[in-house]
Structure formats: C-alpha cells, structure tokens
C-alpha cells in the first residue's frame, strides 16, 4: 500500500462519496469537505483505494438520491444543524473499467458542531438541536396527520425515522423544526408494490406561555416523495419550508410541543446511553456477513428481513443521538446534559446553552469522548452509533413486522465463501445476516477545542471481485500513516468547521 497525492484521487473520492450516500438509508447526504488522506494498492488489474474523507451533512435526505454536490443550500429561515464527519473508505477500480469504482466498505463518525460554533451574543432567540430525536415522534405523527388531511395520496404513509429536531425559543414563542422520513405502508402488500419513501419537514409553533406541546398554534409541513426504484423525486414539487421565525397562526395547528428543556438537550450527559435497542456492537464485531461488493448505485431491492427492523431505523446510519442543544435550559426536552450553556443566538446553527446536558454548553465540562486522536473510542465502539442494521429499502420499518416464517437473512446475500460472520459479544452463532456495507456512527456533539474522533479502520477482509483467488483476502490493513501530500484543501465555503478535524493522523 503506497501513499498517494490527495488531489490526484479527487475524482475517486467524489465518486466514492456519491456511492456511500446512495448506500445509506437514513440521515442526510454527506458533502465532501476535503480528502484528508489517500493510499492505494495495486493487485493485478485492480486498484484498491484507501481514502479518508472529511465530510459535512447537507440538508438533503439521503432518500433523495441526489448527487452530493447537487444539494441546494437550506432555507435560511429554518435552523440548520451543522454536522461534520469523517469516513474511512475502501474502494476498488478495475483498470479496464475506468468508470467502475466500487465501494467495498466504509466507516464514518459524525458529530454536531452547531453548539461549538454558536454565537448567541445579543441574540433574541435560543436555538437547540436535539440528539434524542425520538422524543418528538408524537409531533411528527401529528404533523403527518395534518399533511394527510390535505394530501390524499399520503394516506398510507407512516413516520419512519425522526432525523433532526431543532428548537427556537424566544420572547415571541417557541418553534420546533422536525425532519423525518416516512414510508408507504399500504394495507395490501402486492408482490411488486413499489416501496415508496418520503421526507417531511414540519415546523410547529407554540405560544410563548404554552405549557405543553400538544397544541401548536401553527403547524406547517411539507413532504417530498421518492421512489427508490427510480431514484428520483417523483412529485417534483420542491418542499416549501414555511417561515420558521414567523409566529403567526394562519395554518391549522396539529402538533405538540416540548417544554423547555435545557438547551443542552442532547443527552450529552449520558454519553453512553444505549439506544432503544441496546448498545451497538463494536465496529469490529459487526454481525454481518460480507456479501460481494455492490455495483455502483443502491443495492438491489431484495426482500430483506431482519428481526431488528421493526423499529423504523432503516439504514446504516442510525446513530444513537444525544441531543445537544445549545441553548437554554429549556432545551431539555431530552435529557441532555444541560450543561453548558451554549447560547447561540439566532445563528441558524446556534445552540444555546443546552440545558440539557447537552453539550452545547457542555455544562458538564468534559467532552464525552475526549479527543481520541487515534480513532478508537475508549469503549471500543462508538456508543452513540447504531450498529448498521440489515435494512434496505424493502425493510419493514414502521409498517407491519415481517412474517414469522422469514429468517434473519437476506435472500441472496450469504457470506462470501469461507467467511464466517463475526459474532457479537456473548452471542452464539446465528444465521447469517445480510450485510449492509458500511457504517455511520453518530457521536455526541463536539465542544469548542475538541476534534472529531477518527472512525475505526478495522475493516473485515474481502476478496477482490474478478480475482483469481477469490478466497484470499486482498485488502491490506487500513494505512495508519498519513500521505505526505495530504490532507488536501478544504472546499471553499466550509472554513468554520476545519478546526474540528485532526490535521495529522497517528503514525
């Protein structure tokens, strides 16, 4: 494995990021900030790329299947969380198929830096971003019900995953901004019924003296629908995002409101609080078999079933979140560490003091993970990430649970020959799971002066496709040294987040 020039592999990095985004089933598109490191290895007629990519979440859902650079800037009237990440990626290309870049595996860590960047000085509002988004499922359900009243074609959609929740508080009232995915759950499952997904943005406004979230005085919701088989927006109507800082009451209200939680509602105080399904296994104990690399684009839409799929978390990126508000004490709708107060003025990403143990103010003063410059989380896994589940677009998610006669394996995705699946801690052998390639781990929000812990690099071995010795693993351990001509330059427009990335890697 030899170091290579970061700028020389830019086309591969950009394409790899597009493939990663297209593999993901929840969250927001990653946009490339810079190539932090690059190595390559040549095996016969195949080039293996080992890339480290610094990324930032956009405001476009991965369900949109857009190319990462085609995501428009968000509506500036709506608070937008700043989430950065770093991905270690292994990709391959055959010399005779120059367009055929394949992503073999990837590990990403992500973290919100909104609180750390927030500046609330003289701000008339406090903005909090909640890590514990599940708390607001009820609001999402109410908003979707309202949307259904006005859009008959949405009658069979259900809320899938609550992706982001922001709160804006001030003297004029309180607004909750809830982003969530939905999926079509038709009553009758026809064998080839397309599994349609959507993404909704709901803005709920509450009177300044409201005591609960049940009856917003104003509710605005807009949804887009995506057909995974076409990878296109099938309703063609750009979402209209409402006016987040307008407290008027023209719209019918139908949503709830969370009380004030300390700003730091990101759950930071419980940095290792397990997700509802229990803590994820460590990244190096993935319970997935490794199927062959998928061709570019989303994986085939095979009927996948997996016992953990009933909870709407489809996708590899489910991260267990911690709310990190930055703001005020009220942010606590999620038990966050309300600590630090990170007031963040009106800046769209500002957070206020998270009164919730959030980090925003990390009121508790210490970053839950410290810096871990070597990329290993002290606990051996990223406590906030959800282990990648075997979810695909055909998951059941919020719809009916899979029939009992279906096992835990994907049809058609056994482990590669000779590869036994690694078992999770304390578990005996189980049937092979389908392996959704790649993982994204969400860490608690970063505070000023902290850097994003590096993702794990302990990828399982894989045989190269079309290789003479398919049983022989061909990938080398992920390089730990940094290429001399790296990192590359940050793309313009993202200078404020550069401080959260390590500039050198452990030797």
């Amino acid at each position: 494995v030899s170091p290579t020039d970061c700028s020389a592999v830019e086309p591969e990095a950009e394409k790899a990021l597009d493939l990663i985004n297209k593999r993901r089933r929840d969250g927001y598109l990653f946009q490339l900030l810079r190539i932090a490191d690059a190595h390559l290895d040549r095996v016969e007629n195949t080039t293996v790329y080992y890339l480290v990519l610094d990324v930032q979440e956009s405001d476009c859902s991965v369900l949109s299947r857009k190319y990462w650079n085609d995501c428009e800037p968000p509506d500036s009237r709506r608070p937008s969380e700043i989430v950065i990440g770093q991905c270690k990626v292994i990709a391959t290309r055959h010399s005779h198929e120059s367009q055929d870049l394949r992503v073999i595996d990837f590990n990403c860590t992500t973290s919100s830096v909104s609180s750390a960047l927030a500046n609330t000085k003289d701000s008339p509002v406090l903005i909090d971003f909640f890590e514990d988004t599940e708390r607001y499922r009820k609001q999402a359900n109410k908003a979707l019900e309202k949307y259904k009243e006005e859009n008959d074609d949405f009658a069979s959609f259900r809320v899938d995953r609550i992706e982001r929740v922001a709160r804006v508080r001030g003297g004029e009232g309180t607004g909750y901004f809830v982003d969530f995915s939905v999926r079509n759950c038709p009553r009758h499952h026809f064998p080839r019924h397309p599994n349609v997904f959507g993404f909704c943005r709901a803005d709920l406004f509450y009177d300044v003296e409201a005591l609960d979230l049940e009856s917003p005085k104003n509710l605005v919701i807009n949804c887009e629908v995506f057909d995974p088989q076409e990878h296109e927006n099938i309703n063609g109507v750009p979402p209209h995002l409402g006016h987040p800082f307008h407290w008027g009451g023209h719209e019918r209200s139908s949503t709830t409101k969370p009380p004030f939680k300390p700003h730091g509602s990101r759950d930071h105080h419980h940095p290792h609080k397990p997700h509802e399904h229990g803590p994820p296994p460590p990244p190096d104990e993935r319970d997935h078999s490794h199927g062959p690399p998928l061709p570019q684009g989303p994986p085939p839409l095979l009927p996948m079933s997996c016992s953990s799929c009933q909870h709407a978390t489809f996708g590899t990126n489910g991260a267990q979140r911690h709310s990190h508000n930055n703001n005020s004490s009220d942010l606590h709708p999620h038990k966050h560490h309300s600590h630090e107060q990170h007031p963040h003025g009106h800046h769209p990403h500002a957070h206020h003091p998270h009164e919730h143990d959030t980090h925003r103010q990390h009121p508790h003063g210490h970053h839950p993970h410290g810096h871990h410059p070597h990329g290993h989380h002290p606990h051996g896994h990223h406590p906030h990430g959800h282990h990648p589940h075997c979810h695909d677009f055909q998951d059941y998610g919020p719809c009916d649970p899979p029939p009992h006669n279906q096992g835990h394996c994907c049809h058609g995705h056994g482990p590669p020959p000779g590869h036994l699946r690694r078992r999770g801690p304390g578990k005996g052998p189980r049937p092979f799971h389908c392996r959704q390639i790649g993982s994204v781990y969400r860490l608690p929000p970063l505070r000023k002066g902290e850097v994003l812990p590096l993702p794990e690099a302990n990828f399982p071995s894989f045989p190269l496709p079309h290789h003479k010795h398919p049983l022989k693993p061909d990938n080398q351990p992920f390089p730990q040294s940094v290429s001399e001509s790296c990192p590359g330059k940050f793309k313009s427009g993202f200078p404020q987040v550069s401080m959260f990335f390590t500039h050198t890697f452990p030797k």
Partner: antibody
C-alpha cells in the same frame, strides 16, 4: 386551572432521607412538553433550583446536589416526587414544586410550599 | 453555572416613585431572564420572562429590559403592594439559577 401542592414530613433528623410529593391538577405529565421542577428556599434566603422532570422522564439535577437527589413521577396519579438523602440542617427550607413552560424553564405556576425542618 | 447577582439586597423607594432593580449574569444569557415577586409567606409569582415579556395578568407598571449580562426590572409607579421581595432567574442553561433577591422598602 393549574394547581400544585407540596407535601412532606415536616420534621426529620440529620442523615435521614427526605421524601417530598408534589400533587397537581390542571395538566398531565403524560402530555408532551410538560415539566415540573423542585425549588427550595431556606427561611429568609434566596431560591435554589434542585431538579426538573419532563413528560418523557428526562431528568435534570442541580450538579451541586445531584448525588443526593432523585426526582421521579407517577403520571397516573398526577404526582412528582423528590428524594434527598443524608439530610442535614442546611436542608431546612420551604420546598416548592413549579410547572415550567414549553418555551423555557421559567415558572408561571408554583405550589404554596412545604416547610421541612432538619433538626437533631 | 451561571451566577445571577442582584447587587442591592435592599432598595428604598416611595409610593408613586419609579424604581429599577438590577441583576447581572456571570455570562451572556441571551435575554433568557425571568423576574419573580415574592410576598411574605407566599410562593414566588412570575412577572417577566425572556427579559421583557410581561406575564399574563401582570400590571403594566412592571417592565423588564436588558440583554447580554445586564437586566433590569422597572416599576414605573410603585404601589404599596409592590413593597416586597424580587428575584431574577436565568432560564438559559441548567442549573437554572436565581439572584439573591432585592427587597423593596419604603423610604
């Protein structure tokens, strides 16, 4: 109409555990967004926030007392509880429960308070 | 923790006077400040929140102002029933903290 009412033991001895109950009406802790705090006031002194519990059981504590405090709720009975372990005379105070708002932890509704005296 | 300092424990005034009670936060609390009035033997009563928003039912002689770290409660024309204790509170971040109180007395 929102009403909150605190009750407690009145008098207890140092090292004992203080158990307080806030009974309320006019709102429900099963309603999303609702949260109740405990605040105390030693006689002739200022107010000190102790703990807060939200509808979804999210809890926040004053770090200076966190190791001794436990807040909990019984949603069906419309009650919030506070336990303070290992009390001493400095814990003598009037204890209030108060309802916060969605927009922030400022408190428009308070109980009338219950006086707790810690005395040997 | 954010400390809230009410530098005057007592302030003397006369009925009909205009009086201003001040509160200083140890850091910028972005207008997340409330004011309470407490009469002897009673629980505190909210007057102002978000620095300047008067709570429902509070007489309009009470006004709040301020930003950053400095906040003021002003009573434009003091009435006899206003001669009591006033507290500020920051609702910016936990732990939510109160000032030490200012007692308004008759001159």
């Amino acid at each position: 109409q929102v009403i909150l009412k605190e009750s407690g033991p009145g008098i207890l001895q140092p090292s004992q555990t203080l158990s307080l109950t806030c009974s309320f009406s006019g709102f429900s802790l099963s309603t999303s967004g609702v949260g109740v705090s405990w605040i105390r006031q030693p006689s002739g002194k200022g107010l000190e926030w102790l703990a807060h519990i939200y509808w979804d059981d999210d809890k926040h504590y004053n770090p200076s007392l966190k190791s001794r405090l436990t807040i909990s709720k019984d949603t069906s009975r419309n009650q919030v509880f506070l336990r303070i372990t290992s009390v001493d005379t400095a814990d003598t105070a009037t204890y209030y429960c108060a309802l916060g708002t969605v927009g922030g932890p400022w408190f428009p509704y308070w109980g009338q308070g219950t006086l707790v005296t810690v005395s040997a | 923790d954010v400390q809230m300092n009410q530098s005057h424990k007592f302030m003397s005034t006369s009925v009909g006077d205009r009086v201003s009670i001040t509160c200083k936060a140890s850091q910028d609390v972005s207008t997340a400040v409330a004011w309470y009035q407490q009469k002897p033997g009673q629980s505190p009563k909210i007057l102002i929140y978000w620095a300047s928003i008067r709570h429902t039912g509070v007489p309009d002689r009470f006004t709040g102002s301020g930003s950053g770290t400095d906040y003021t409660l002003t009573i434009s024309s003091v009435q006899a029933e206003d001669l009591t204790l006033y507290y500020c509170q920051q609702h910016y971040s936990t732990p939510w903290t109160f000032g030490g109180g200012t007692k308004l007395e008759i001159k």
